[in-house]
């Protein structure tokens, strides 16, 4: 058997000592004679030890013994003991008792023979077995005074060899993760949950992570089991960005020719039906009315102009009804209505004139007289020596119920090259030039234009009266929207419950799938905030698309250009949502077109205003924006600018 070098030397040293034993004993007797019984000099002591190191060690201490006990001649027993002990460096034993196997006396020196695991001159230093090759341990080596042992990291156990480690499979214990999935790992294990859930070690269960607390959303955040959704202020013109967390501007994706003509006057600006222009003419000289202008409209009904005095005196109103010119007049309290001429709401320019002659009024379209009415009196009325005439354009200075025959005064029409009383009119021209809202689009087509900044609403009833009920259904919502969008996000149609501030129903354009968190151009049909159905749409192609929505007891369908949309809810969820809608329909609801009122962004999938052309048919009735309970003044009721032609 081979021993390490250090152990071998320690094993050999005692044997060497035994070889010198005889010599040591002889030396002791010689010392007795020369230096204990007699007083010896350094030279004599040298002869005893026969070497310098032991002599140099002995002699100074010998002199100390003399100083302490007196010379040999005093025969003090303490002196003899003192001197006899000097050559043995192991007495008293300088080595550490715990770590020493034996002390070996050397010439003026000593050697401590150490036990295994100890080292150092005095065998008082523990040997760190772990410092070399980790003491042979695979994982953890623990050093101990005079010894060491191996151990393993948490999740491992020590093999029978006392040195290697093997993995513990914690997942073998079915209680390790409780409800969660257990995955064994080297030296450990992990309790796994689905995305959006986090493991609770206390409850040993998966708990929903509230991502909203992490501030992931730029604006509004709604947490849901295992997920979350961000919402942006649609009414503020914002939508979700690609990352589905931040917000970005809703920008037009189809350019519309929205250029306006500074030499035109838009008549449909005031939804209230009040005039867009009020002129006051006053003359010392009796004067007759002469008005001429170019006019263009698609609107079938509305007021072009009023001329005269106050409502009970003498006045005329030139209006449009069913696309034809109508003249209402009141002379000295007697009212009349005349309608004649061609249909003129074809969207093309034509010249219209009203001329007051001596005893009649003549109305011309493109210089051809279409009406000639005999009148008794003058429109300019004398008052305190001056003749007065009020002329208003696009409305009347009193309520429409006070007309000879009530009419909807709102007229989405355009006027240019106007001439009142044969005079140059710098006032209106100057006003229009600086106010773009008073100007018309240079080019228009049929339809209604929603500029992305407002809505219109109606008070419609969706509950069928008992007379209508031939089927089991007691309510229905059927919407057909012809749209030519200019932007990819916006509310087309919605119902709003003012009492509950809820959005019972909405149909909107959206550019992402909220649950799949995927950017995609869609039409969404929703009850409150829940999407019932989705359908893809090529929203930015500049083409007209038809969106059809049909909801009644037990069914809800969404179609885009004749293709049916994908249902987003189960049959049970659909029934529950339709029941919610029906509850809302039994209370007062308002029908919104092109947007929503100021509701929380979480009320519906989309809250942004629609931008583009749209006509709406609700329950087989075309909605006329002039008939709305309210319409934003920037929405044009019967005209829409065309898509800008692509640059060559």
């Amino acid at each position: 058997a081979l021993l390490p070098a250090r152990e071998a030397t320690q094993f050999l040293r005692p044997r060497q000592r035994r070889a010198f034993q005889v010599f040591e004993e002889a030396k002791q007797g010689h010392l007795e004679r020369e230096c204990v019984e007699e007083l010896c000099s350094r030279e004599e002591a040298r002869e005893v030890f026969e070497n310098d190191p032991e002599t140099d060690y002995f002699y100074p201490r010998y002199l100390d013994c003399i100083n302490k006990y007196g010379s040999p001649y005093t025969k003090n027993s303490g002196f003899a003991t003192c001197v006899q002990n000097l050559p043995d460096q192991c007495t008293p034993n300088p080595c550490d008792r715990k770590g020493t196997q034996a002390c070996q006396d050397l010439m003026g020196n000593f050697f401590c023979l150490c036990k295994a695991g100890w080292g150092g001159r005095l065998c008082d230093k523990d040997v760190n077995e772990c410092s070399q090759e980790n003491g042979g341990c695979l994982q953890i080596c623990h050093n101990k005074p005079g010894s060491f042992h191996c151990s393993c990291h948490s999740g491992f156990e020590l093999s029978s060899d006392g040195r290697t480690c093997q993995d513990i499979d914690e997942c073998a214990d079915s209680e390790a993760c409780g409800e969660a999935r257990c995955k064994n790992l080297p030296g450990s294990y992990s309790c796994l949950c689905d995305e959006g859930f986090a493991y609770s070690s206390q409850e040993k269960a998966c708990r929903d992570v509230d991502e909203c607390l992490q501030g992931r959303c730029e604006q509004v955040c709604v947490n849901s089991p295992g997920s979350y959704t961000c919402h942006c202020d649609g009414r503020g013109g914002l939508k979700l960005s690609q990352d589905m967390d931040t917000c970005e501007d809703i920008l037009p994706c189809v350019p519309f020719s929205v250029a306006k003509s500074v030499k035109s006057l838009y008549l449909g600006r005031m939804f209230s039906g009040t005039p867009v222009i009020r002129l006051r003419f006053k003359r010392l000289q009796p004067t007759r009315l002469v008005a001429e202008f170019d006019f263009r409209t698609f609107d079938p009904e509305g007021i072009l102009l009023f001329a005269g005095g106050h409502q009970d005196s003498t006045w005329i109103v030139l209006a449009l009804r069913a696309g034809r010119l109508e003249l209402q007049l009141r002379y000295n309290g007697v009212g009349r209505v005349t309608s004649s001429g061609p249909v003129i709401n074809h969207g093309m320019w034509q010249t219209i004139s009203v001329e007051e002659l001596a005893r009649n009024l003549v109305i011309k379209v493109n210089r051809d007289a279409v009406m000639k009415i005999a009148v008794a009196g003058d429109l300019f009325q004398p008052e305190r020596g001056l003749y007065h005439l009020n002329l208003t354009v696009g409305g009347i200075p009193f309520h429409e119920k006070d007309l000879v025959q009530p009419i909807n005064p709102r007229l989405d029409g355009c006027m240019r090259s106007w001439n009142w009383l044969n005079g140059e009119d710098t006032t209106i021209q100057e006003t229009v030039k600086v106010n773009t809202r008073m100007q018309c689009f240079s080019v228009t087509e049929r339809g209604s234009f929603y500029p992305g900044s407002g809505f219109a609403f109606y008070s419609l009833d969706y509950m069928r009266t008992p007379l209508d009920v031939g089927t089991e259904s007691t309510w229905e919502v059927e919407v057909v929207a012809h749209i030519r969008p200019a932007a990819d996000t916006g509310v087309l149609f919605a119902l709003w419950a003012p009492d509950l501030r809820a959005v019972p129903l909405s149909v909107a354009l959206v550019d992402y799938h909220s649950t799949k968190k995927l950017k995609k151009q869609l039409v969404v049909l929703a009850v409150e905030h829940t999407a019932l159905a989705l359908m893809e749409i090529k929203v930015c192609d500049g083409q007209e698309h038809v969106v059809t929505v049909s909801l009644r007891d037990g069914e809800a369908t969404l179609e885009v250009d004749g293709t049916r949309g994908q249902s987003e809810v189960s049959a049970a969820q659909l029934q529950e949502r339709l029941a919610v809608l029906e509850r809302h329909l039994r209370s007062p609801v308002l029908t919104f077109a092109g947007g929503l009122p100021d509701v929380p962004v979480t009320s519906a999938p989309v809250t942004a205003f629609y931008r583009g052309c749209m006509t709406l048919e609700v329950n087989r009735r075309l909605l006329d924006l002039d008939e709305a309970a309210y319409k934003h003044s920037d929405i044009t009721a019967h005209s829409c600018p065309p898509v800008e032609p692509a640059a060559a």
Epitope: F281, L386, G423
Partner: antibody, heavy 116, light 107 residues
Framework: QVHLVQSGSELKKPGASVKISCKAS????????MNWVRQAPGQGLEWMGW????????TYTEEFKGRFVFSLDTSVTTSYLQISTLKAEDTAVYFC?????????WGQGTLVTVSS | ETTLTQSPSSLSASVGDRVTITCITS??????MNWYQQKPGKAPKLLIS???TLRPGVPSRFSGSGSGTDFTLTISSLQPEDFATYYC?????????FGQGTKVEIK
């Protein structure tokens, strides 16, 4: 463009007569009446009256009845103011102004000086 | 006849000052008040017509207010070219009558 151009300054002796003209252009002359306004040196404006350009009928304020006459020549779209038996206090700038209930368009004014 | 009392008859002001001229009528004239500016040797220029309407081409620093019998012409920030004489004119009834005028001079 509406323009009213008046005749030049006049220096007259007391008792004499003067006739100043106001030539209108840029509009239908007979559609608007013509007004006359006086401004004595360092004084304010005084409305003298007006003439109906359709009928030629003049209307004078109380202060200007008698020696003052408004007349027309529609063929040359001109209105006239004649002052007879001139007095020193008739020294003033006389303006014509188109009738619009108020006065938007004015002639440049004609200074009539009455001095012996 | 409706008489117009204009005040002050003259005022001194500096460029940038806010200037107010008033005109009081002897009868209620609704809002049939007009304001004119006249510079020496020139014809009057209409600034504000009936209904406190600012005329085309007139700077927005000029404004008219009032109805009934009390009327005001305000120049919000006097400019060098505004030093002139200002007149009010009522067009409610015949005879038409002017105020005596207010001369705005440089301080």
């Amino acid at each position: 463009q509406v323009h009213l151009v008046q005749s030049g300054s006049e220096l007259k002796k007391p008792g004499a007569s003067v006739k100043i003209s106001c030539k209108a252009s840029g509009y239908t002359f007979t559609n608007y009446g013509m007004n006359w306004v006086r401004q004595a040196p360092g004084q304010g404006l005084e409305w003298m009256g007006w003439i109906n350009t359709n009928t030629g009928e003049p209307t004078y304020t109380e202060e200007f009845k008698g020696r003052f006459v408004f007349s027309l020549d529609t063929s040359v779209t001109t209105s006239y103011l004649q002052i007879s038996t001139l007095k020193a206090e008739d020294t003033a700038v006389y303006f014509c102004a188109r009738d619009e209930g108020w006065f938007v368009y004015w002639g440049q004014g004609t200074l009539v000086t009455v001095s012996s | 006849e409706t008489t117009l009392t204009q005040s002050p008859s003259s005022l001194s002001a500096s460029v940038g000052d806010r200037v107010t001229i008033t005109c009081i009528t002897s009868t209620d004239i609704d809002d049939d008040m007009n304001w004119y500016q006249q510079k020496p040797g020139k014809a009057p220029k209409l600034l504000i017509s009936e209904g406190n309407t600012l005329r085309p081409g007139v700077p927005s620093r000029f404004s008219g207010s009032g109805s009934g019998t009390d009327f005001t012409l305000t120049i919000s920030s006097l400019q060098p070219e505004d030093f002139a004489t200002y007149y009010c004119l009522q067009t409610d009834s015949v005879p038409l009558t002017f105020g005596q005028g207010t001369k705005v001079e440089i301080k």
